[in-house]
Each structure stands twice: as C-alpha cells, then as structure tokens.
C-alpha cells in the first residue's frame, strides 16, 4: 500500500513524493534501498531529497531502483517506498505503455486532460501540449492551468496526449514530459451540484467525553466516475492538517461508491479521546466539484448519562 511506482525519461527532471504523508514540519529521510545509503539534501547534488520530495535533476537510467522514505515525527515513524524507473528516450514517436499515465475519458461536455504529476514541479504556465507527437494548434485546444480543454470533442480526438513543461530549480531549467491516453465516450455520465447525504445540515452529534467519535462526510456528485469531486472536513474553517490537533484526523473512505446510480465520496473524521474543548468547535463537511461547493455544519454535544429515576 505504501509503495508507489514512478517513472521518467533520462535527461528530464523527475520528482517523486514519499507515499507516506506527514505534516510539513516532520522530517523525511530518504535512502537508496539496496545499499541503505542516505540520499543527500544538498541541492548541488543531481539527486537530492527535499522533505517529502525526492528530486532527480536530471534523471539518469542508472537512478532506477527502490528508494525508501521515512517520515519522522516526535511520536512515530512511517516508512514508504518509491519504485523509480528511468527509461532511455525513444527515437521514434511512439510512447510505450510503460511510460503512460492513467487513461482519461472525455465527452462532448467534459473534455479535460490533466497533465500528470505536474503539481510536484515548479513550473510556469502555459503548458505545451502534443497529440501523437504533433503540437496542438487551433482554437479548439485551450491550455488552461494544469490541463488541456478540447472544445466540441469528436471521436478523432482520441489518442495519446503529451504535456511538456519546464521545471525550474534554483535558476536551472529542466524539461519534463508526461503522456496519457484520451478516449472519447458517449455522454452517459453527468455531474451535478454536490448533494451531501451526511451529515444533515446543523446536525448535533452526541459524543461521550473520553471515548472515540467518528463523523462521516458523504456526498454524491452525479452519474459515472467523478474525476473532479472532493470531500473534506474543516474545523472552525481551517483544514484538519492546519488545525494542529493530532487527536483529530480525517481518513478517505473508498475512492468512489455508488448510491442509487450516483457516484459518491466520503471522508471520515476520527476524534480520539473526545475532550470538552472539542464540543466548542464547528465541524464543516465540504463537498465540491466544478459546479460549486456545498457545506454542512455539525456540532458535538455531550451525551447525557441515562437518568435512573426511582
């Protein structure tokens, strides 16, 4: 579960994130698994560690292998593995399957192709996009933030799309390319404004002091896979990671479940050892997609012990 495949091309930048996540304040140590040798953090090295990120600037075929990252906090250590493969550049135009990121599907109404892994890099818009190695031209193609939008999608738009961008590290520029297949499907799915099934708006949840409590934020977003949906919890309007209370953590539910044919996501908020001060907080379940954001607020109340009247 905590192993991740990463791949890149020689002489391009490759940045890999540790599969184990932690707060930015936690230290992350990286090792080359075969030798247990520590990876340096000094940026003058071609391969160096930078917190949760392992950077190959640029990558070489010999860098291929398994890398270990250990996230260290004052109370625990978490270990993850990055399986890195660096390939030689192909002389012809064909992109082999092993260099392909996940296939995305589009339709007349929804034709966004995301540039894979781009968020790991220090890049500047706009992106360059290619289809089957040809630079995309014409008003139907719009490079927009980290994705390509194709207007009036047709079946002929199916194919392999490559995004190309420049990663900048301390003034030095490195090229990065990433390719994924795009398929065109008949419009069967649809998205709608998020509908939060739980919790109810302004719900009061009874909890026992000293016990554990779980709150589930569950929302549905439409029919078919909803690539652009998200659910999360906030405390007093603040992200859980920012709130800084280790007793309170959120955990993703299964990636996508289906209810009455609708695609739904859920996020569980786990509160360990409920304290009095937890009753003072505002718990917001947020659900969002391209249509917008919906918020339901929950408050906790102390569960009264059952009165036994004689």
């Amino acid at each position: 579960k905590f192993s991740k495949q990463s791949w890149g091309l020689e002489n391009e930048a490759l940045i890999v994130r540790c599969p184990r996540q932690g707060k930015p304040s936690y230290t992350v140590d990286w090792y080359y698994s075969q030798t247990n040798k520590s990876i340096p953090t000094q940026e003058r090295n071609r391969v160096f560690a930078s917190g949760q990120l392992l950077k190959f600037l640029p990558a070489a075929v010999a860098d291929s292998g398994i890398y270990t990252c250990i996230v260290r906090s004052p109370t625990f250590n978490r270990t993850g593995y990055a399986n890195v493969t660096i390939y030689k550049k192909q002389s012809d135009c064909n992109v082999p399957d092993y260099l392909m990121y996940s296939t995305v599907s589009g339709s007349e109404k929804n034709s966004k192709i995301y540039c894979p892994t781009i968020d790991l890099y220090n890049w500047t818009a706009p992106l360059e996009w290619f289809k089957n190695c040809q630079a995309l031209q014409g008003s139907r193609y719009r490079a927009h933030k980290s994705f390509l939008v194709i207007d009036n999608v047709m079946t002929e738009d199916a194919g392999d799309y490559t995004c190309k961008f420049i990663h900048n590290e301390n003034g030095a520029n490195y090229s990065v390319t990433a390719t994924r297949s795009f398929t065109v499907k008949d419009e069967q799915g649809f998205s709608l404004f998020p509908v939060i099934g739980a919790p109810a708006q302004n719900e009061i949840k009874e909890v026992e002091i000293g016990k554990n409590a779980n709150l589930t934020c569950s929302a549905c977003f439409g029919k078919g896979t909803q690539f652009l949906a998200a659910v999360l919890w906030q405390l007093n309007g603040t992200k859980i990671t920012d709130f800084g209370e280790p007793r309170i953590q959120q955990e993703e539910g299964q990636n996508q479940s289906f209810s009455n044919g609708l695609a739904c996501l859920d996020m569980v908020l786990r509160i360990a050892d409920v304290k009095e001060e937890d009753l003072l907080l505002q718990y917001d379940c947020l659900a969002l997609n391209l249509h917008g954001l919906r918020r339901h607020t929950v408050r906790l109340s102390r569960k009264n012990p059952i009165d036994h009247h004689s």
Epitope: P116, Q226, K239, T241, D242, L286, L288, N289, L293
Partner: antibody, heavy 129, light 107 residues
Framework: QVQLVQSGAEVKKPGASVKVSCKAS????????ISWVRQAPGQGLEWMGR????????VYAQKFQGRVTMTRDTSTSTVYMELSSLRSEDTAVYYC??????????????????????WGQGTTVTVSS | DIQMTQSPSSLSASVGDRVTITCRAS???SSWLAWYQQKPGKAPKL??????NLQSGVPSRFSGSGSGTDFTLTISSLQPEDFATYYC????????TFGQSTRLEIK
C-alpha cells in the same frame, strides 16, 4: 491564527526591479497557495499570479508574464514576488493573500481555489524618476 | 479572460437598510465566486466564498446567492461598519479576475 507579514515600502526608479516578501506564521505553510494581488492608487484589485509553496509551482497572469517571478523559501515560510522593468503604472500597493484550495480526490493535481481568506498588510511600491 | 461586472459602482444607503450588490460574469463560472470588503488603507476581507458560503467570523447579515453568470451580495440590515468598498472575484479559471468595485456610502 495564520498571519502574513509583508516587507516594507519601496521607492524604485523606472526600469529597476522590486522584490517583496511575505512571511507566514501560525499555520502549515505548504498546505495553501499564495496569490499576489495589487491595487493602484484609487483603483481596483488586480491578480498577478499564484505560487504553491509545497511544489513551488507558479501561474502568472498573462499581463505580467516575463516580468514577474514568484518564489518561496520553505525554511523561513516566506514567499517572494519580484517585478522587473518597473514603470510608473506599477506604482501600487502589493498584497499577498492565502488562497484556500482543495484537490480533487481522483485528480490530486487539480485544485479548486475558493477564496483568499488571509491577507498581508500590503507593501507600497512607488515607481518614480 | 473572464470579465466580472459589478453594479452599481456606487451606492448610498442608511443604517438599517437592506442593500443588494450584483456581479455578472462574462461566461459561466458555476458557483466559483467570492465577495470581499475593503476599507480605506486596509487589505480586503473575505466575506463569502463559493457564491453562498459565509466565511467564518463574518456577521450573518451578509449573504450571497447565484450561480452561472449572475450573483448577488445582500446585506440585510446595514451597520455603520459596513460602509466600505466591495469586490466580487471569480476563481473558476485563471487568471483570477475581480469586479471593478462597488462603493457603499452613508446617505
């Protein structure tokens, strides 16, 4: 409580560059993007661009492309905005603002930005010969 | 770029009045609209995000509505501290764009 503290006022000559800093305290620096917004005297708000402190990735408004550079120093929780080839119309108050965002579950590279909820106090930059 | 047009550009009202400011986008932005309040010499303050969600700590007399291209900010009962300049802002696509402002003055 998160705070953004900006560097002091600057007076520059046309053609020069200015670098404004924005230091974050009291929160997780890397979990939010930082936008830069400027306001010329008596005018409205103008978005210049955004930097993701986690990755260092930037998006700039076309108007400033080639003249603006946004960088960050994670060790000091500081972001910087440098504007070059200054002209008199760049005279303005420059604000940094925390841009609240959420990543899509199945497309973690795609972010929704839905409000700049914490702002710096502003840095006045005057361009005059 | 998406153009944001606010109306009116200025407005005079009295304490206790109900006030409405509108914002129109040049194309659909779904519900990705925020409202800000700015007082002279100060940084803007977020009031409403995602069209209708009240930011934490903002009085409930402020409310937002709308989707697509037409949006409204309503102040149900004006208070003396509400006299300021208001901006709408879309975050549907980059570049982020703001409305040209509405100045709310005391009548």
């Amino acid at each position: 409580q998160v705070q953004l503290v900006q560097s002091g006022a600057e007076v520059k000559k046309p053609g020069a560059s200015v670098k404004v800093s924005c230091k974050a305290s009291g929160g997780t620096f890397s979990s939010y993007a930082i936008s830069w917004v400027r306001q010329a005297p008596g005018q409205g708000l103008e978005w210049m661009g955004r930097i993701n402190p986690n990755s260092g990735g930037t998006v700039y408004a076309q108007k400033f492309q080639g003249r603006v550079t946004m960088t960050r120093d994670t060790s000091t929780s500081t972001v910087y905005m440098e504007l070059s080839s200054l002209r008199s119309e760049d005279t303005a108050v420059y604000y940094c603002a925390r841009d609240t965002s959420i990543a899509a579950r199945l497309n973690p590279d795609y972010y929704y930005y839905y409000g700049m909820d914490v702002w710096g106090q502003g840095t006045t930059v005057t361009v005059s010969s | 770029d998406i153009q944001m047009t606010q109306s009116p550009s200025s407005l005079s009202a009295s304490v206790g009045d109900r006030v409405t400011i509108t914002c129109r986008a040049s194309q659909s932005i779904s519900s990705w609209l925020a409202w800000y309040q700015q007082k002279p010499g100060k940084a803007p303050k977020l009031l409403i995000y995602a069209a209708s969600n009240l930011q934490s700590g903002v009085p409930s007399r402020f409310s937002g509505s709308g989707s697509g291209t037409d949006f409204t900010l309503t102040i149900s009962s004006l208070q003396p501290e509400d006299f300021a300049t208001y901006y709408c802002q879309q975050s549907y696509s980059t570049p982020v764009t703001f409305g040209q402002s509405t100045r709310l003055e005391i009548k």
